[in-house]
């Protein structure tokens, strides 16, 4: 098997399968490049965030160039050895979401609740519509909490 000079790096292996495996890879001359050998593909150095291998690495030791992910459609936010970028998240209107920060080559889309929608969990995959009050509002709907409504028959001072 191929060997290499010492490498010590925190990398993410998205390994052409789209799987994220964070690891510290340490290799020394005459040792196997543990973590760099995947499915018969052999990579010496990872691509930086925002890029991917132009093609899969091969056992013969030639090192494919890194090429950029498709801006606004794909990203990679960590160094990795994959020939694929991750696709950008779509902020799905049907789940009550809208774009807060657009996807870049190095960062996935950030979503937030649409106006008049809220989400009370820490990671929002779905936002619910704010309740419309029939008898008046105690507390307005926010991004993280639903409207609090007055009950029927309650009086305001």
């Amino acid at each position: 098997r191929l060997s290499s000079k010492s490498v010590n790096a925190q990398v993410t292996d998205i390994n052409s399968k789209g799987l994220e495996l964070r690891k510290t890879v340490t290799t020394v001359e005459t040792q196997n490049l543990e973590g760099l050998h995947h499915d018969g593909q052999f990579c010496h150095k990872p691509c930086p965030p925002g890029e991917r291998k132009a093609r899969d690495c091969t056992v013969n030791g030639d090192e494919p160039d890194c090429v950029p992910c498709q801006e606004g459609k794909e990203y990679t936010d960590k160094a990795h050895f994959s020939s694929k970028c991750r696709r950008c998240r779509l902020c799905d209107e049907g789940h009550g979401l809208e774009v807060e920060i657009n996807c870049t080559r190095t960062q996935n889309t950030k979503c937030r609740c649409k106006p008049n929608f809220f989400c009370n969990s820490t990671v929002c995959e779905h936002c619910d519509p704010c309740t419309k009050c029939e008898h008046g509002i105690i507390k307005e709907c926010t991004l993280t909490s639903n409207t609090k409504c007055k009950e029927e028959g309650s009086r305001s001072n």
């Epitope: 789209g18 694929k84 991750r86 696709r87 998240r89 779509l90 049907g94 789940h95 990671v123």
Partner: antibody, heavy 121, light 111 residues
Amino acid sequence: QVQLVQSGAEVKKPGASVKVSCKASGYTFTSYWMQWVRQAPGQGLEWMGEIDPSDSYTNYNQKFKGKATLTVDTSTSTAYMELSSLRSEDTAVYYCARNRDYSNNWYFDVWGQGTLVTVSS
Amino acid sequence: DIVLTQSPSSLSASVGDRVTITCKASQSVDYDGDSYMNWYQQKPGKAPKLLIYAASNLESGIPSRFSGSGSGTDFTLTISSLQPEDFATYYCQQSNEDPRTFGQGTKVEIK
């Protein structure tokens, strides 16, 4: 309600091309990617590719690159899939489906009724 | 490509039975803690219909007797009490990696 209505069945000769349409209604067409899936007679489902109607960006299954071409007409909320150089193996039902995203998991929530394309000499 | 293998390929069951269909992926379809697996139902001559997305989320309008579970490489679709309208073919589908792939299908027939 959300609906995808596809064009009718087609019979084509080998070597010909065919263009299948998929008209969307009941939602904002440019807000959701459109997916295309094929199903050969008696077989399972096979993903062909997708198109973002907001900018016509396409992403194909490598197997269908050069075989299928995806386009949209936003003025009529219609997606199209053209198949070229038809062979008997292309005989299948072709479906369009609306794409949804739940935390980066893409799935197909509404499907067209399917268009049968038969390739026969 | 990620290969999805469903089992069984077909099964015979009676109305009221609990039915379990499994889908095994050739490699993990999880990413950042999320499972990228969906389930569809298809009846003869009809388009597929979404049942479950992201492994365990029930699509709006689908009866609660359908449920999904699993992570990594092993996923399950369960019908808690089979109804006459549930006799159909069921497909799993992964969306973690392109090309997106489907299982070969599981046909649920009347015993």
